[in-house]
Amino acid sequence: EKAMVDGSWLDLAKRSKLEAQPFAHLTINATDIPSGSHKVSLSSWYHDRGWAKISNMTFSNGKLIVNQDGFYYLYANICFRHHETSGDLATEYLQLMVYVTKTSIKIPSSHTLMKGGSTKYWSGNSEFHFYSINVGGFFKLRSGEEISIEVSNPSLLDPDQDATYFGAFKVRDID
């Protein structure tokens, strides 16, 4: 009986530790996509609707803030699209890029952790164009560090929650 009680306490401890593991999945806020034809920071994301969720991390001022030191898996998926019903592309040669950036407040500095993308020729003869970028990686992050997303040509972003999103989850503690 004592072993059973110990086992349940162990399960409970494990479960509460798992529940405390930080994670975030943020989806693009389609009503507030910035304009620009060069690299811009995407600051408007959902954290509590549809597929978007956050736990033991903070979303503030367009940045995902780490609350616990640890090794995290970071990921981002960005979709670009253009359909002729919205008009024509002013240029057919495009650089479609995403940059995942870490900013440290304690030692003011910014580092690009991941980038992805391609140069594309989107011919005006086609009715529809689509391009997707997915990047992911394993990083040591400290409490207070901030993760943000920058993209080129935000006017071409696909605004759906299953198309443009980023996130993070803690994998293990720093020894």
Partner: antibody
Framework: QVQLVQSGAEVRKPGASVKVSCKAS????????IHWVRQAPGQRLEWMGW????????KFSQKFQGRITVTRDTAASTAYMELRSLRSEDTAVYYC???????????????????WGQGTLVTVSS | EIVMTQSPSSLSASVGDRVTITCRAS??????LNWYQLKPGKAPRLLIY???SLQSGVPSRFSGSGSGAEFTLTISSLQPEDIATYYC?????FGQGTKVEIK
């Protein structure tokens, strides 16, 4: 304020060419596209083509492909539309119009014609 | 190629009347539809863009609605200065126009 001022009326014989100018003022010419639209007597408005004043890229209606040239002079903030091999059915009022999409804000030419020139009557008659 | 069809082709109404013009697209165009006013000898004027957004400087008696393939332009209280031909437009395609006259 934003203004588009077009050149004056022209009369041409069939087979000839005409070149219409459109001088822009009151905004940064290079940041917008200029469209050319015409209206023949009793007909609906008809889109002919556009030029991205910043990089010179152009797009034309299939109907005018091979007969139309659109150019711009950024120093003079002026766009030009030349139509060749004129026929009587090209008799129309030709308009230039600014696209509302600012190329600094994005790269889609959205076909919102927010400012128009006063129109240039081109008459093709033998 | 998308074709825009307007109805009616002309209408006659009294000052103060509510006037409605319909525009249909041959396929769905979301909300990418604009309305213009054209008076003889004058430059055309953008009234409504994106199906329902009023262009700055345009009187509030003009309004637009619709999405997909069916759209309407409404003049809530017709004024003498509204005598003109009205065109709907989606990218490269214009409707054939609706001529509005005063009774």
């Amino acid at each position: 304020q934003v203004q588009l001022v077009q050149s004056g009326a022209e009369v041409r014989k069939p087979g000839a060419s005409v070149k219409v100018s459109c001088k822009a003022s009151g905004y940064d010419f290079s940041n917008y596209a200029i469209h050319w639209v015409r209206q023949a007597p009793g007909q609906r408005l008809e889109w002919m083509g556009w030029i991205n004043a910043g990089n010179g890229n152009t797009k034309f209606s299939q109907k005018f492909q091979g007969r139309i040239t659109v150019t711009r002079d950024t120093a003079a903030s002026t766009a030009y539309m030349e139509l060749r091999s004129l026929r009587s059915e090209d008799t129309a009022v030709y308009y230039c119009a600014r696209d509302d999409s600012n190329m600094v804000r994005g790269i889609i030419i959205a076909y919102y014609f927010d400012y128009w020139g006063q129109g240039t009557l081109v008459t093709v008659s033998s | 190629e998308i074709v825009m069809t307007q109805s009616p082709s002309s209408l006659s109404a009294s000052v103060g009347d509510r006037v409605t013009i319909t525009c249909r697209a041959s396929q769905s165009i979301s909300r990418y539809l604009n309305w213009y006013q054209l008076k003889p000898g004058k430059a055309p004027r953008l009234l409504i863009y994106g199906a329902s957004s009023l262009q700055s400087g345009v009187p509030s008696r003009f309004s637009g609605s619709g999405s997909g393939a069916e759209f309407t332009l409404t003049i809530s209280s017709l004024q003498p200065e509204d005598i003109a031909t009205y065109y709907c437009q989606h990218t490269r395609a214009f409707g054939q126009g609706t001529k509005v006259e005063i009774k």
